[in-house]
């Protein structure tokens, strides 16, 4: 699986989940996150070459199409496989608010 | 929606299905295939600019790092959201068979 | 049951010829996309050659020219000659059969071993 316990320990050139941390305030200007002051949200990156952890048959076929036909423009995509939420501490007025978002930290990666 | 019926009829350069004919025997090198000779499998392409049909919160934030930090590498992809099946016709010795092939033709992108 | 059955890997000098084989079940060979990749150590699989049941063909740059791969459909095998062997070719080989019919699915053999030394 092209996740973070492969991924995070191999050099990988291909398709691979990779480690991005995001601060909320420098990075996104995002004052009203209070905690944490960031995350790894990690991303993914890399060429998805023939058979590579393929999504659907159409990135299958797309994958040995662009393998057969080098020239072509069409191919798989790495993008997110598996995500998990991030729980943050925010401020309405005075009042605290805990809230778990959805789909925040990218645990793995596919092609698409 | 980044679909067929929006983005074959405008000229648009940040993402969206884009056409792709496959003639089976040419272009992938199957000959097992009887009919269709081929068909539109489409392909996703384009950049994703922030908050271009994103698809996760990942991706809506991933979409404004890249727009506040361009020197950055990280940055959604162009993927395939809607696929539609292909049913075909190839024999087992002199026997035909018909299949449904789920997930072959591309109708609609996203930014994921 | 699919099985893919790979053979022909041994011990060679820099420069020697090895031929591989791959049989696969004929309930797929028929409609299968076949593949050889390879892993050497510590590193990742790659692909080496694949070719279509129309004879389609595809290598990798490091062995082109020096690696053929061919198919017998009376057989239902799959071979890849190797010539010109170098250390660098040494590595497990693995052969795998791609089909899309009945499912999309992707058979591999348990590989063999190549090694290229003097």
């Known amino acids: 699986a092209l996740d973070t316990n492969y991924c995070f320990r191999n050099l990988e050139e291909n398709c691979c989940v990779r480690p991005l941390y995001i601060d909320f305030r420098q990075d996104l200007g995002w004052k009203w996150v209070h905690e944490p002051k960031g995350y790894y949200a990690n991303f993914c990156s890399g060429p998805c070459p023939y058979l590579r952890s393929a999504d659907t048959t159409h990135s299958t076929v797309l994958g040995l199409y662009n393998t057969l036909n080098p020239e072509a423009s069409a191919s798989p995509c790495c993008v997110p496989q598996d995500l998990e939420p991030l729980t943050i501490l925010y401020y309405v007025g005075r009042t605290p608010k805990v809230e778990q978002l959805s789909n925040m930290v990218v645990k793995s990666c596919k092609c698409s | 929606a980044l679909d067929t019926n929006y983005c074959f009829r405008n000229l648009e350069e940040n993402c969206c299905v884009r056409p792709l004919y496959i003639d089976f025997r040419q272009d992938l090198g199957w000959k097992w295939v009887h009919e269709p000779k081929g068909y539109y499998a489409n392909f996703c392409s384009g950049p994703c600019p922030y908050l271009r049909s994103a698809d996760t919160t990942h991706s809506t934030v991933l979409g404004l790092y890249n727009t506040l930090n361009p020197e950055a590498s990280a940055s959604p992809c162009c993927v395939p959201q809607d696929l539609e099946p292909l049913t075909i016709l190839y024999y087992v010795g002199r026997t035909p068979k018909v299949e449904q092939l789920s997930n072959m033709v591309v109708k609609s992108c996203k930014c994921s | 049951e699919v099985q893919v059955v790979e053979s022909g890997g041994a011990a060679v000098q820099p420069g020697e010829s090895l031929r591989l084989s791959c049989a696969a079940s004929?309930?797929?060979?028929?409609?299968?996309?076949m593949g050889w990749f390879r892993q050497a150590p510590g590193k990742q699989r790659e692909m080496v050659a694949i070719?279509?049941?129309?004879?389609?063909?595809n290598y990798a740059d490091s062995v082109k020219g020096r690696f053929t791969i061919s198919r017998d459909a009376t057989k239902n095998t799959v071979y890849l000659q190797m010539n010109s062997l170098n250390p660098g070719d040494t590595a497990v080989y693995y052969c795998?059969?791609?089909?899309?019919?009945?499912?999309?699915?992707?058979?591999w053999g348990q590989g063999t071993q190549v090694t290229v030394s003097s």
């Open positions: 795998n059969a791609l089909t899309i019919v009945p499912r999309s699915s992707i058979y």
């Open positions: 070719i279509t049941d129309g004879g389609r063909t």
């Open positions: 004929g309930s797929i060979f028929n409609t299968a996309t």
